[in-house]
């Protein structure tokens, strides 16, 4: 059997890739099934008319070439066509109708625009399952896509609108990727995803959504990616009926709270990722803590870390005690108990919680003060922390545990005057350890240090509020204060003066 001299032929696999070819070589054997022609300089003129006679060819790799039109003269029974990284601008019915058995079409990194896809171009493509159009020039989703499509990738285009009808017939679609486009909520036609009854994965990462989309298909959606948008609102019905959803990611948005019960329908959720949102841990978010504490072990929730108000900044929502949510109508006030070894005059904390004090403040209304814990009794997992400023940029943290623990989460945060200021650093320390040296801090700056037991379960039997302490790094002239905090040393609770 012949093989073009510039190629290598091996049992139906024809390797003509990376040869600087400007045309497809003549003499490809008739039993060829796969043509590797990638990484050449083949242009449209260089596709010979007799290529269509190779009726056994099922896969053609023509990516990274010099095609500026959709190629013609392709073998009729081709199933996989890889045309990435060319300069193809148009998709016509004439070219697609000649390869009606196509199942996968890879057109990533070309120059296809919405107007350059001929209306009805895909009307005879009744076997097409995968259509990849990432990194093209699309401003909208092309209409008239075949209803056989199972995966549609349109990431990194310029899509600002999706028309209601464009996706409506795609009842076989399982995976839709729209990352890195220009979509806002106005650009999403009404019920645009609603009829995608087999959709299991929807990705809208890196767009301009300000609200989580509604009317999502509930029958089969399993993964929903909404990270890196501008979402500041989740409509109460956004996740209704999404009973199959197991992964939801809304990281890197602008969410400060969530409507109560928003996750009620998510019967199968196992991964909920909400990192890097400005969560405001006020009364509206108390339900989230209660919900988190009721979750089974299999549910993995990440990123619910308070950014405001300042008194709880840096704390995990699930670790907050009920009193810290400031639900004024509940009659609950803070009952955190703190002692300190810092003299009054030495580097007092700057109005952050918990404020180191040396005496109990006056209690205006003792009847209002009640220590509400989930078990009705104080937590027995007492941690006594001592913090010492060793050098202007280093603090030494040591702790004692009343009960043995497998691990603890240690975090520290430079305090500032706005929620956007400062970043939380955390580390996991094993239960056997009793000290930790934090370096590379800023001199003469206030820090909050928190410790909390690391639980293996999300079912809480004790009050797991973090034990926190504030300290200040020494000025460049050396000073070594020592601060001690223990939630259970005080005999009587008192109202935190910094709380309203």
């Amino acid at each position: 059997k012949s093989c073009p001299s510039v190629c290598r032929c091996d049992a139906g696999f024809i390797y003509c890739n990376d040869r600087s070819l400007t045309s497809i070589p003549v003499g490809i054997p008739e039993d060829a099934t796969t043509l590797y022609l990638q990484n050449n300089q083949i242009n449209n003129v260089g596709i010979p008319s007799d290529l269509k006679n190779l009726l056994k060819v099922q896969r053609i790799y023509l990516y990274h070439n010099s095609l500026d039109e959709f190629p013609t003269n392709l073998p009729k029974y081709v199933k996989e066509l890889h045309l990435q990284e060319n300069n193809i601008r148009t998709i016509t019915y004439d070219s697609l109708s000649k390869i009606p058995y196509l199942e996968e079409l890879h057109l990533d990194d070309n120059s296809v625009s919405a107007v350059s896809i001929e209306e009805g171009a895909f009307r005879d493509s009744n076997y097409l399952r995968l259509l990849f159009l990432s990194r093209n020039h699309l401003s909208t989703i092309p209409g008239g896509l075949p209803r056989t499509i199972e995966e549609l990738r349109l990431d990194d285009n310029r899509i600002s609108t999706i028309s209601s009808p464009s996706l409506h017939g795609l009842t076989s679609l399982k995976r839709l990727v729209l990352d890195g486009n220009l979509l806002n909520n106005h650009g999403l036609g009404d019920k645009v995803f609603f009829n995608l009854v087999n959709l299991t994965e929807l990705s809208l990462v890196r767009n301009s959504l300000t609200a989580a989309p509604v009317n999502l298909p509930g029958t089969s959606l399993r993964k929903l990616y909404l990270q890196d948008n501008h979402i500041n609102r989740v409509p109460p019905n956004a996740f209704s009926y999404l009973r199959q959803l197991y992964r939801l990611d809304m990281s890197n948005n602008n969410l400060s709270n969530l409507p109560q019960g928003i996750f009620d329908d998510l019967d199968n959720i196992t991964q909920l990722i909400l990192r890097n949102n400005p969560w405001y841990c006020g009364c509206k978010m108390k339900w989230v803590r209660d919900w988190l504490q009721s979750l089974p072990v299999k549910v993995n929730v990440r990123g619910l870390m308070c950014q405001a108000p300042e008194k709880v900044r840096g704390m995990a929502i699930k670790d907050l005690s009920a009193e810290l949510f400031d639900c004024k109508d509940s009659g609950i006030v803070s009952t955190i108990q703190i002692t300190t070894a810092i003299p009054n005059t030495a580097y007092p904390a700057q109005g952050q919680w918990p404020a180191p004090v040396t005496k109990q403040p006056d209690i205006k209304n003792p009847k209002l003060i009640k220590d509400q814990r989930t078990t009705g009794s104080p937590s027995r997992k007492t941690i006594l922390i001592t913090v010492k400023s060793v050098t202007p940029d280093t603090i030494h943290i040591s702790w004692r545990l009343a009960l043995p623990m497998t691990a603890l989460r240690l975090s520290w945060l430079k305090l500032g005057h706005s929620p956007a200021f400062g970043s939380i650093t955390e580390t996991i320390v094993t239960g056997e350890r009793s000290e930790y040296l934090v370096t590379a801090l800023e001199p003469e700056s206030p820090y909050r240090v928190c410790m909390v037991p690391m639980e293996t379960s999300n079912l809480y039997l004790f009050d797991e509020t973090p034990v926190c302490i504030e300290t200040q790094t020494a000025p460049l002239r050396m000073y070594n204060p020592t601060t001690t905090l223990n939630r259970e040393q005080e005999k009587e609770p008192y109202k935190n003066p910094n709380l309203p």
């Epitope: 919405a114 107007v115 209306e119 009805g120 009307r123 401003s139 909208t140 209409g143 008239g144 209803r147 600002s160 609108t161 028309s163 209601s164 009808p165 464009s166 409506h168 017939g169 009842t171 106005h186 650009g187 999403l188 036609g189 009404d190 019920k191 645009v192 009829n195």
Partner: antibody
Framework: QVQLQQSGPELVKPGASVNISCKAS????????MNWVKQRPGKGLEWIGW????????NYNGKFKGKATLTADKSSSTAYMQLSSLTSEDSAVYFC?????????????WGQGTLVTVSA | DIQMNQSPSSLSASLGDTITIACRAS??????LSWYQQKPGSIPKLLIY???NLHTGVPSRFSGSGSGTDFTLTISSLQPEDIATYYC?????????FGSGTKLEIK
């Protein structure tokens, strides 16, 4: 070729209901959305909604929810629109219209229209 | 709902003239716009779809342009048979909405 044949004119009393039909031929009826459009005498066009005969799934203009009910019978390739609780405001010509390619938003094929007159 | 603002509401021109009809959407509809011609007592007829694509059988003197929110229908070399009412339709979002129509008359 695509053809849409609508039922004849209807004279109905206020409060009653009416059923309009649209028989399709020349294409795969189950695969293309069927739209319905209202035109009052001397006035413009209003989109009522569309139905996908393949599974009976319908989408309505909110203005016509409760007023219009769209159904389809695949076996006879016929789409139906029922209008209920009729008032004089419902007196109009009603068109069925098919999209150019199955389910896009432009209507290339139109029925001849059915005139509904609501009068006591 | 997306509003379609069509202007002018009526237009009088001479045979052979070039006329334009404008349609403005209340929000971005990309290229999801079509134009229809309706003669008195007749059904609407598709002229232009996808903002600029001429439908089969429509004379080439009809053309459409625009994207986003602003669209125009142009009829060059006006003919007597062009006397009709013209409508735009947005197909971007449910509910689909028509413009209010432009009635074209011959001077």
């Amino acid at each position: 070729q695509v053809q849409l044949q609508q039922s004849g004119p209807e004279l109905v009393k206020p409060g009653a209901s009416v059923n309009i039909s649209c028989k399709a031929s020349g294409y795969a009826f189950g695969n293309s959305w069927m739209n319905w459009v209202k035109q009052r005498p001397g006035k413009g066009l209003e989109w009522i909604g569309w139905i996908y005969p393949g599974d009976g799934n319908a989408n309505y203009n909110g203005k016509f929810k409760g007023k219009a009910t769209l159904t389809a019978d695949k076996s006879s390739s016929t789409a139906y629109m029922q209008l209920s609780s009729l008032t004089s405001e419902d007196s109009a010509v009603y068109f069925c219209a098919r999209a150019l390619y199955d389910y896009d938003g432009w209507f290339a094929y139109w029925g001849q229209g059915t005139l509904v007159t609501v009068s006591a | 709902d997306i509003q379609m603002n069509q202007s002018p509401s009526s237009l009088s021109a001479s045979l052979g003239d070039t006329i334009t009809i404008a349609c403005r959407a209340s929000q971005n509809i990309d290229i999801w716009l079509s134009w229809y011609q309706q003669k008195p007592g007749s059904i609407p007829k598709l002229l232009i779809y996808k903002a600029s694509n001429l439908h089969t059988g429509v004379p080439s003197r009809f053309s459409g342009s625009g994207s986003g929110t602003d669209f125009t229908l142009t009829i060059s070399s006006l003919q007597p048979e062009d006397i009709a009412t013209y409508y735009c339709l947005q197909g971007q979002s449910f509910p689909f909405t028509f413009g209010s129509g432009t009635k074209l008359e011959i001077k």
